[in-house]
């Protein structure tokens, strides 16, 4: 086939490193799935580069990605979610590099939201709750969540708790009194689907009371 890059463009291109990574998000917009890919090297000149996915699609054999600045993106219902797809970087119709990927193994969940902390005076504990859109989904329903919290003054001293529910109890005796805490949560697929951690939820800030404090929600 003709129509490839001319004047040594391809030869030059082949010297570059076109390593890329992708993640999928299932039912991210109603019944639509998304697939996002980007080059590992942020300095790659993406001007004439295209991404294409072929195989393990419904109704079509190949689909081309849309380019949004430095990322490449598809939103579609047409992922078969069985078997591997071939994802290729192309220039002028010629493939530079390809990866065979099962989209069910590169799932990145949506970030949890509505994180809050309520102090229970009688129980001397803090009830952490959050929400996830995945409770309503057909495919990626089972997640492992990572709740991370730290005392605000301890920049890098994060404590982590893994849980499969959306509710966690922190005992008051395990936290410093009269201290400001930051807490956040992220999710990863935990059954059949595999992949990556979601983005972190927005952080929630709460203050631990003195030993005797009135009940109610912690002020953010």
């Amino acid at each position: 086939e003709s129509g490839y890059a001319q004047n040594g463009d391809l030869e030059d291109a082949e010297l570059d490193d076109y390593s890329f990574s992708c993640y999928s998000q299932l039912e991210v917009n109603g019944s639509q799935h998304s697939l996002t890919c980007a080059f590992e090297d942020p300095d790659v000149n993406t001007t004439n580069l295209e991404f294409e996915i072929c195989g393990a699609l419904v109704e079509v054999k190949c689909l081309s990605f849309r380019k949004l600045q430095e990322i490449y993106f598809i939103e579609t219902k047409k992922f078969l979610l069985i078997g591997k797809s071939n994802i290729c970087v192309k220039v002028g119709g010629k493939s530079l590099t390809c990866k065979k990927i099962d989209l069910t193994t590169i799932v990145k969940p949506e970030a949890p939201f509505d994180l809050s902390v309520i102090y229970r005076e009688g129980a001397n504990d803090f009830v952490v709750t959050f929400n996830t859109s995945h409770l309503q989904k057909k495919y990626v329903k089972v997640l492992m969540h990572d709740v991370a919290y730290r005392q605000e003054k301890d920049e890098n001293k994060w404590m982590h708790v893994n849980l499969s529910s959306t509710k966690l109890t922190l005992l008051q005796r395990n936290l410093q009194p009269e201290a400001m805490y930051e807490i956040k949560v992220r999710s990863i697929p935990d059954h059949y689907f595999k992949g990556f951690w979601s983005e972190w939820s927005p952080s929630y800030y709460f203050r631990t009371p003195e030993i005797n404090n009135s009940p109610g929600e912690m002020d953010p």
Partner: antibody
């Protein structure tokens, strides 16, 4: 965005050559199908050339059909041999999009007659 | 190949009347697609992925169905809706079209 061209009249047993010229779309990133429409057979999907260069054909006419492309000229070609009167039809090229056959050419009338 | 049978083959509807065109597949398909064609023109995408309206299609049109049974509905017939409607399946090769339903204004 798609325009078919080719001879309007073809002799029986001869070969039909049609061209679909694509504008406003990057040919290497698109899938182009050929469809024909005749009073007797209605709309008939003939075949497709995918963005990766693979082709798929309607098994009923596969042995007579070839679809290729020249990306530098933004053109897709249909060649079909051993034409008979039942191949008389309006021939369309269309994009096999993510959702449907979303862009169609205006069509070209092909008559098979001596 | 999957055979698509459209019914009715022809019909006439008065302005304001509700119209339903059906398309039955000989085997289950993932989605059904519908096209509108007027005399002398190429088919226009009308409904895709069984129920999504193509750009510019009035919302009096709707599509529904699953498996082997699909339909296109016009909630209130208008003069400009007079045309031939075709269904298409892309779930298996060869892609196949229904025989068409010619809708006329009464």
């Amino acid at each position: 965005q798609l325009k078919e061209s080719g001879p309007g009249l073809v002799q029986p047993s001869q070969t039909l050559s049609l061209t679909c010229t694509v504008s406003g779309l990057s040919l290497p990133n698109n899938n182009i199908a050929w469809i024909r429409q005749s009073p007797g057979k209605g709309l008939e999907w003939m075949g497709v050339i995918w963005s990766n260069g693979d082709t798929d054909y309607n098994s009923a006419i596969r042995s007579r059909l070839s679809i290729s492309r020249d990306s530098s000229k933004s053109q897709v070609f249909l060649r079909m041999n051993s034409l008979q009167s039942e191949d008389t039809a309006m021939y369309f090229c269309a994009r096999e999009g993510m959702t449907t056959l979303d862009y169609w050419g205006q069509g070209v009338v092909v008559t098979v007659s001596s | 190949e999957i055979v698509l049978t459209q019914s009715p083959t022809t019909m006439a509807a008065s302005p304001g009347e509700k119209v339903t065109i059906t398309c039955r597949a000989s085997s289950s398909v993932s989605y059904m697609h519908w096209f509108q064609q007027k005399s002398g023109s190429s088919p226009k995408p009308w409904i895709y992925d069984s129920s999504d309206l193509a750009s510019g299609v009035p919302d009096r049109f709707s599509g529904s169905g699953s498996g082997t049974s699909y339909s296109l509905t016009i909630s209130s017939m208008e003069a400009e809706d007079a045309a031939t409607y075709y269904c298409l399946q892309r779930s298996s090769y060869p892609r196949t079209f229904g025989g068409g339903t010619k809708l006329e204004l009464k």
